[in-house]
Interface confidence: low
């Protein structure tokens, strides 16, 4: 039921991020008076889609409708009926539609068609649907957190404490995980950034910031995992193949056709004498380490230093916060918390993959072993990323704070996306020109 | 190796304060949340509270809420644990342990500080 | 707090099995990992941790001890049981916070 006391003067936003391996729905909220202020605008709500990513329904596109209603439904119910009209609604798709339309432009803009068409029938005021570049989702998620963390302003927060307080203006750089690809976003410490694609500039609430940013498609945990299997299946010397990433005793049939859908594994393509081969887990943390490893080529930079593949990488500067899949792994194995040191994670990951597979899955019943059975991986991956490929160390490890929510708000790129579109962050303070959509595009 | 090292065995009258250490070394305490534990003669365990020296914030268990301070100094890698109005059922022996990683191995204890509290 | 209630007293022949049970008043378990410990005290000796996040082993302990449960019953098990195991027995939860059994008191027959 509709609350019929007096109308609050507020505003709402909706942004539904189509990522690689689901969909997520949220809603946002702020005072309609307050729209130029930083850190008036919060989450309300967080709605999952059940099901995969939208890239998936690329053959059966008369799904995706029933696909989004649930979530669509409940956007109706949050949000009061007299404000429907005027609630935008936004769609970015990520990295696993980036994958798709590298295969087939026609496909993904068919996928992209429906959903379109899809949310238009709802009440709302909707805005399109685009596949964002890798550059914007970094951009987008150092807004939010910075944004959430109060770090655009030196005027009084609306809420009382804030996380991560370290007493300066000094930005947080981002760190995200998806499922097909990860972004690093931050302000270096007076260096030029050698590479023009990874350079962005923002004027935020009157001070300039110069930005570095880098999207590795490809590297998101379920890619990534992929890109090893295919790999690791070369050398195989039959259909066996005994996988230091999978807990002990562990086993899986995956079928050849299935490991070469991706574009992510064409570089180690290659005809094998089989269509499908049987993972069996040996549980062995350094061994895995190894393995992913060799997913990083470090031995080519035309640059003053990098981080894989080319890419160029300034010197790590401030704190860091790690959201998305980096968040939820290492939740998941109980490693979020401030007081872990590197090593004390390099030692809990050995542990855990080391577990048999029938106790770990004893231990964690009320999991899917989909997931379950992939955190050894993730984990291994997550620590290999951040050491071997953005060039973190056991000391300034301490500088990455895993961040799931900042104050009831899921740090992601979702808020900076519709901040920008909705024109709330300002280029000077305290009121002007909203940042324009081609700033850092 | 790391060790916990407490103050020793203390005498008070009701209504004093007692002040106990617990110095650690092998490892830095800020690497730890560090908590205090005691035990009544021929009772279980009771925990008080931690503290968590990097941020010197602290967690009390509702009993010692407005009895109990907890302290740290890193500079001499030692936490304190002091306890106000006693009265002769605090009469105890007092532990620190470290915890590392909330909920896995409490990985360290100290050999245990006897306050007796008599008039 | 969480409460933790135990079994007061076990009398267990050597070379038998003895278990000992801990009921928590409100669940222990958080994003699939299971916040319960179990210590042996011996007189005038700190606690001893024997088993962390219900059922791993921590570092030393004999296979003997073994720990079981989820949510809010739990067991420890000592098999078999050896002279030496006389002790007190305290479970513990450390999902929110701590908070310590009661004790159980283990007498070899």
């Known amino acids: 039921t509709q609350n019929k006391a007096l109308p609050e003067n507020v505003k709402y936003g909706i942004v539904l991020d189509a990522g690689s391996s689901h969909t997520s729905l949220y809603i946002y909220k702020w005072p309609a008076e307050k729209e130029n202020d930083t850190g008036v605008v919060h989450q309300v709500e967080e709605c999952r889609v059940k099901g995969p990513g939208i890239s998936k329904f690329v053959q059966k596109v008369n799904e995706i409708g029933i696909y989004l209603t649930d979530c669509m439904e409940r956007a109706r119910e949050v949000i009061p009926r007299s404000q429907h009209q005027e609630t935008p609604v936004y769609l970015g798709a990520t990295a696993g539609m980036r994958l798709l339309r590298m295969e087939s432009e026609e496909l993904a803009d068919r996928v992209l068609d429906v959903v379109e068409r899809s949310l238009s029938n709802y009440p709302f005021d909707f805005q399109g649907a685009r596949i964002i570049t890798g550059q914007e989702e970094g951009a987008y998620g150092w807004i939010t957190i910075n944004y959430l963390l109060g770090k655009f302003s030196q005027k009084t927060r609306w809420f009382s404490i804030v996380p991560y307080e370290t007493n300066n203006q000094e930005t947080f750089g981002a760190l995200d995980l998806g499922g097909a690809s990860t972004q690093v976003t931050f302000v270096p410490q007076n260096q030029t950034i050698e590479s023009p694609d990874n350079a962005l500039q923002f004027r935020l609430y009157g001070k300039d910031y110069n930005v570095y940013t880098h999207s590795f498609l490809c590297y998101g945990k379920d890619q990534a995992l992929w890109q090893k299997l295919a790999k690791d299946i070369q050398v195989a010397s039959n259909e066996i193949l005994r996988d230091p990433c999978f807990h002990p005793g562990y086993k899986k049939v995956v079928n050849v056709s299935d490991l070469y859908k991706t574009p992510c594994t064409k570089r180690f393509e290659m005809t094998l004498p089989f269509q499908q081969f049987e993972i069996q887990g040996i549980g062995n943390y350094q061994q895995c380490h190894q393995s992913i490893l060799e997913l990083f080529n470090t031995s080519y930079c035309p640059y003053s230093q990098c981080a894989f593949n080319g890419i160029f990488l300034p010197p790590l500067q401030g704190d860091f916060g790690a959201f998305s899949a980096f968040y939820f792994v290492m939740k998941f194995l109980n490693l979020t918390s401030e007081k872990v040191s590197q090593e004390k994670v390099t030692e809990m990951m050995k542990k855990f993959c080391a577990q048999p597979w029938e106790e770990i899955k004893t231990s964690y019943a009320g999991v899917k072993e989909k997931y379950l059975s992939e955190y050894c991986f993730s984990g291994t991956y997550i620590l290999s990323l951040l050491l071997q490929g953005y060039h973190f160390t056991a000391d300034s490890w301490e500088h990455i704070h895993f961040i799931g929510k900042i104050q009831g708000s899921d740090a992601g790129w979702t808020l900076g996306y519709m901040l920008n579109l909705t024109n709330m962050i300002p280029a000077e303070q305290p009121l002007s020109t909203p940042l324009s959509h081609s700033t850092y595009v | 190796q790391v060790q916990l090292v407490q103050s020793g065995a203390e005498v008070k009258k009701p209504g004093a304060s007692v002040k106990v250490s617990c110095k650690v070394s092998?490892?830095?305490?800020?690497?730890?949340?560090m908590h205090w534990v005691r035990q009544a003669p021929g009772k279980g365990l009771e925990w008080m509270g931690r503290?968590?020296?990097?941020?010197?914030?602290?967690k009390y268990a509702e009993k010692f809420k407005n009895r109990v301070t907890m302290t740290s100094d890193t500079s001499t890698n030692t936490v304190y644990m002091e306890l106000s109005s006693l009265r002769s059922e605090d009469t105890a022996v007092y532990y620190c342990?470290?915890?590392?990683?909330?909920?896995?191995?409490?990985?360290?204890w100290g050999q245990g500080t006897m306050v007796t509290v008599s008039s | 707090d969480i409460v933790l209630t135990q079994s007061p007293a076990l009398a267990v022949s050597p070379g038998q099995r003895a278990t000992i049970t801990c009921r928590t008043q409100?669940?222990?378990?958080?994003?699939?990992?299971?916040?319960m410990n179990w210590y042996q005290q011996k007189p005038g000796q700190p606690p001893k941790l024997l088993i962390y996040?219900?059922?791993s082993l921590a570092s030393g302990v004999p296979a003997r001890f073994s720990g079981s449960g989820s949510g809010t019953d739990f067991t420890l098990t000592i098999n078999p049981v050896e002279a030496d195991d006389t002790a007190n027995y305290y479970c513990?939860?450390?999902?929110?916070?701590?908070?310590f059994g009661g004790g159980t008191k283990v007498e070899i027959k």
């Open positions: 342990a470290t915890e590392r990683v909330p909920g896995f191995e409490t990985d360290y």
């Open positions: 092998g490892d830095s305490i800020t690497a730890y949340f």
């Open positions: 503290i968590d020296p990097d941020h010197e914030r602290t």
């Open positions: 409100q669940t222990v378990d958080h994003y699939g990992t299971t916040y």
């Open positions: 996040l219900a059922s």
């Open positions: 513990q939860q450390s999902r929110n916070l701590w908070t």
